[in-house]
Amino acid sequence: QRLPRMQEDSPLGGGSSGEDDPLGEEDLPSEEDSPREEDPPGEEDLPGEEDLPGEEDLPEVKPKSEEEGSLKLEDLPTVEAPGDPQEPQNNAHRDKEGDDQSHWRYGGDPPWPRVSPACAGRFQSPVDIRPQLAAFCPALRPLELLGFQLPPLPELRLRNNGHSVQLTLPPGLEMALGPGREYRALQLHLHWGAAGRPGSEHTVEGHRFPAEIHVVHLSTAFARVDEALGRPGGLAVLAAFLEEGPEENSAYEQLLSRLEEIAEEGSETQVPGLDISALLPSDFSRYFQYEGSLTTPPCAQGVIWTVFNQTVMLSAKQLHTLSDTLWGPGDSRLQLNFRATQPLNGRVIEASFPAGVDSSPRAAEPVQLNSCLAAGD
């Protein structure tokens, strides 16, 4: 039986925003923790495992040319990584040799829990969002962003770090999840798939979107990321799905048009400052929120994820540019850079709007299975 779709409103105008209803009619629900139709073949969404592409999914090989303090991680795993001895519970960084996050990658060895034990934690990201099961929390107010409209100067660093394309943000971009929940934006990066294959990290009722943007924020209670890691609410990520639309997205084009300059792993370029908020949906009032983790090693938990209900539209050409321009480690294309969805393990995803209500005429009575726990605390 099909789960109801997200509540359908007409998208708000302006900006780069797309559909307010991310699900198409063809999207079918799937069991939590079962393989997703769009996932790489053979992928089982097991805790702490990364995607394992099948043979046909291996990135194209690039012809040879001439030429990444003390971390405090909580909620560390009580499970044993397969084939590994039980890891200590209180140090994601055991020592420089034993816990080397420098050699992780998508789609293969080493298993991420060996790279960082926190990757086998119980409250990991990304997750599959099932609107019908989300808890409506009226206390979740519209997000507040301040200082996101940047002038052209100073320019910003856009870098291919081998795992994604990352834009480093200057000081002064302030974000509030609610009263007393204040953050500053540090960087944004993207996750994508490959030709004809979606690559968002989060999914909605098993549906994977073409791509996903993450804007990473640090709580104003901390001065450094490594101080905030593992602390509940220490980091917050705003996430939005990118979908194909009929028109070019001018905000994204300011970044996508520069990708050729940073095709090689490790390369970077300078881009004029831009309106960062234009890269996000225009509706800051409708979103899902849950506590999870970083989606790459060290997979530190305590991260507050806010996933917009509204999507952002890019043209087919832009999505192709995103997935087909950059090169990653080992002279392979930088593609399919998303982690498998992770089990909720009892977590309840909260919604700032009644997401479980089917707006179609068939719905006689709204059903909301989970109640709001402590929104706004």
């Epitope: 990444e68 420089k96 420098s102 990658r105 540090l186 990321v225 970083l294 060290p298 480690p329």
Partner: nanobody
Framework: QVQLVESGGGLVQPGGSLRLSCTAS????????MGWYRQTPGKQREFVAR???????YLTDSVKGRFTISRDNSKNTLYLQMNSLRAEDTGVYYC?????????WGQGTLVTVSS
């Protein structure tokens, strides 16, 4: 307290060599992407080379074939081997460490290429 300390700069004749070092403390060095930048007289700070946490290296076109970037995680140290130096390589060379959203800079070491 995070510190990046560059060393190895100095005066060298055109065609000569220098090896810059950047020693990091207060960070878990192995997880950071490390880079070298330089500020030459009258110009903005520019990117020279980067080595990712995984070991992938990239050098900007003007130094390819002459410079080599490397790292020794056991010593928390980043290196830039500079050969066939030219007058236009003169400037202050800065070390950068970047990870997730943390971004740290050293104070710089001066390289002068002159006869």
């Amino acid at each position: 307290q995070v510190q990046l300390v560059e060393s190895g700069g100095g005066l060298v004749q055109p065609g000569g060599s220098l090896r810059l070092s950047c020693t990091a403390s207060g960070i878990i060095f192995s997880v950071y992407d490390m880079g070298w930048y330089r500020q030459t007289p009258g110009k903005q700070r520019e990117f020279v080379a980067r080595i990712t946490a995984g070991g992938g290296t990239y050098l900007t076109d003007s130094v390819k074939g002459r410079f080599t970037i490397s790292r020794d995680n056991s010593k928390n140290t980043l290196y830039l081997q500079m050969n066939s130096l030219r007058a236009e390589d003169t400037g202050v060379y800065y070390c950068n460490a970047a990870w997730i959203g943390d971004d740290y800079w050293g104070q710089g070491t001066l390289v002068t290429v002159s006869s």
